[in-house]
């Protein structure tokens, strides 16, 4: 799996999970979230050569096609596979609210 | 939806469905498929600016972050959403076989 256990420990230019910290105020301009200040969102990046973690039959076809026709820019792309939620604390007036924001943290990647 | 109805009728640099014909022998080196000779596989390509057909909360976060830090290459990517199968005819010896290959045709796209 193209997850932290593999990607963070290896030199990998191909599609893999990359660490990324997001600060809500600084990076997104979101001032409404009280806690946490930011979080490890991660992201997916890297090349998708033939058979590198292909998600579907179409992505396998596309990566094979791309080896023959690289100028077509018709290659698969490295995107998130498994995502996890993030629990946040915010206020409505003076009332604290705890909420789970779905699909906020990328845990693994795929070529799609 | 970023499908043929929208994408093939509009000039769209952002993420959208693009037409692509794949010839099995010429483009993939697959000689085992008897019919069809090729098919309209299509593919997804284009930029994923903030809120352009974002698939998840993470892709929305990432596209917003990317406007501030484009050099990070941490932007969402344009990938397939809906896929359809393709029916093919091939031979085992002299026996014809009809099979449905799943997820071979891209029908719409998303930013993920």
């Amino acid at each position: 799996a193209l997850d932290a256990a593999y990607c963070f420990r290896n030199v990998q230019d191909n599609c893999c999970l990359r660490p990324l910290y997001i600060d809500f105020k600084r990076d997104l301009g979101w001032k409404w979230i009280h806690e946490p200040k930011g979080y490890n969102a991660n992201f997916c990046a890297g090349a998708c050569p033939y058979l590198w973690s292909s998600d579907t039959q179409h992505s396998r076809v596309l990566s094979l096609y791309n080896t023959i026709n690289p100028e077509a820019s018709a290659s698969p792309c490295c995107v998130s596979q498994d995502l996890e939620p993030l629990t946040i604390l915010y206020y409505i007036g003076k009332t604290p609210k705890i909420e789970q924001l779905s699909n906020m943290i990328v845990k693994s990647c795929k070529c799609s | 939806a970023l499908d043929a109805a929208y994408c093939f009728r509009n000039v769209q640099d952002n993420c959208c469905l693009r037409p692509l014909y794949i010839d099995f022998k010429r483009d993939l080196g697959w000689k085992w498929i008897h019919e069809p000779k090729g098919y309209n596989a299509n593919f997804c390509a284009g930029a994923c600016p903030y809120l352009w057909s974002s698939d998840t909360q993470h892709s929305r976060v990432l596209s917003l972050y990317n406007t501030i830090n484009p050099e990070a290459s941490a932007s969402p990517c344009c990938v397939s959403q809906d896929l359809e199968p393709l029916t093919i005819l091939y031979y085992i010896g002299k026996t014809p076989k009809i099979e449905q290959l799943s997820n071979m045709i891209v029908k719409s796209c998303k930013c993920s």
Partner: antibody, heavy 119, light 107 residues
Amino acid sequence: EVTLKESGPVLVKPTETLTLTCTVSGFSLTTYNVHWVRQPPGKALEWMGLIWNTGGTRYNSALKSRLTISKDTSKSQVVLTMTNMDPVDTATYYCARDPVPNKWHFDFWGPGTLVTVSS
Amino acid sequence: EIVMTQSPATLSVSPGERATLSCLASEDIYSNLAWYQQKPGQSPRLLIYDARSLQDGVPARFSGSESGPEYTLTISSLQSEDFAVYFCQQHHAYPFTFGQGTKVEIK
């Protein structure tokens, strides 16, 4: 163990180009970002620029026209190139790592290399 | 760019005493501040990040706090190994900038 080590010439002449190499171990350049920071003798630190885990770069606008940062992930090396060197560029040059990309503080530093610009 | 102003330039303290170092940001940096310790001939060492988070391996006598645009590094009881130069750094906006440093010397 995480280590970074700078190497390159200790003396360069004015108008020449400086090339410094930062060799890292204990972590991957496809996972972490690497920054360059310099410090003139007895003075404050100055952030110069960084190279992302994905290969993108960002430079201090005051130095942007003279700086190039690149890397060779297979060799675990980051290279700083600075053109048109001047005596005011005499400083100790450090490479450093941020603990998580986009955290923007530096948890591991190289020992630094003193570069003197003089004719 | 964001200007970081440290005070005092030099702080004379006896071992065992408390030291308080200040760093003022020219604009709001939303707690995105780090503190480093540097000894002669050595590279900086990260002590505090996010204004108040203690870096792994750093003694608990070091602490960070903030009040508006002013950020403070406190060393509760100075040890002999703490005499050094301390720099603050904002990690809020490009270009990341450092203060000019505070030298903590033996009184």
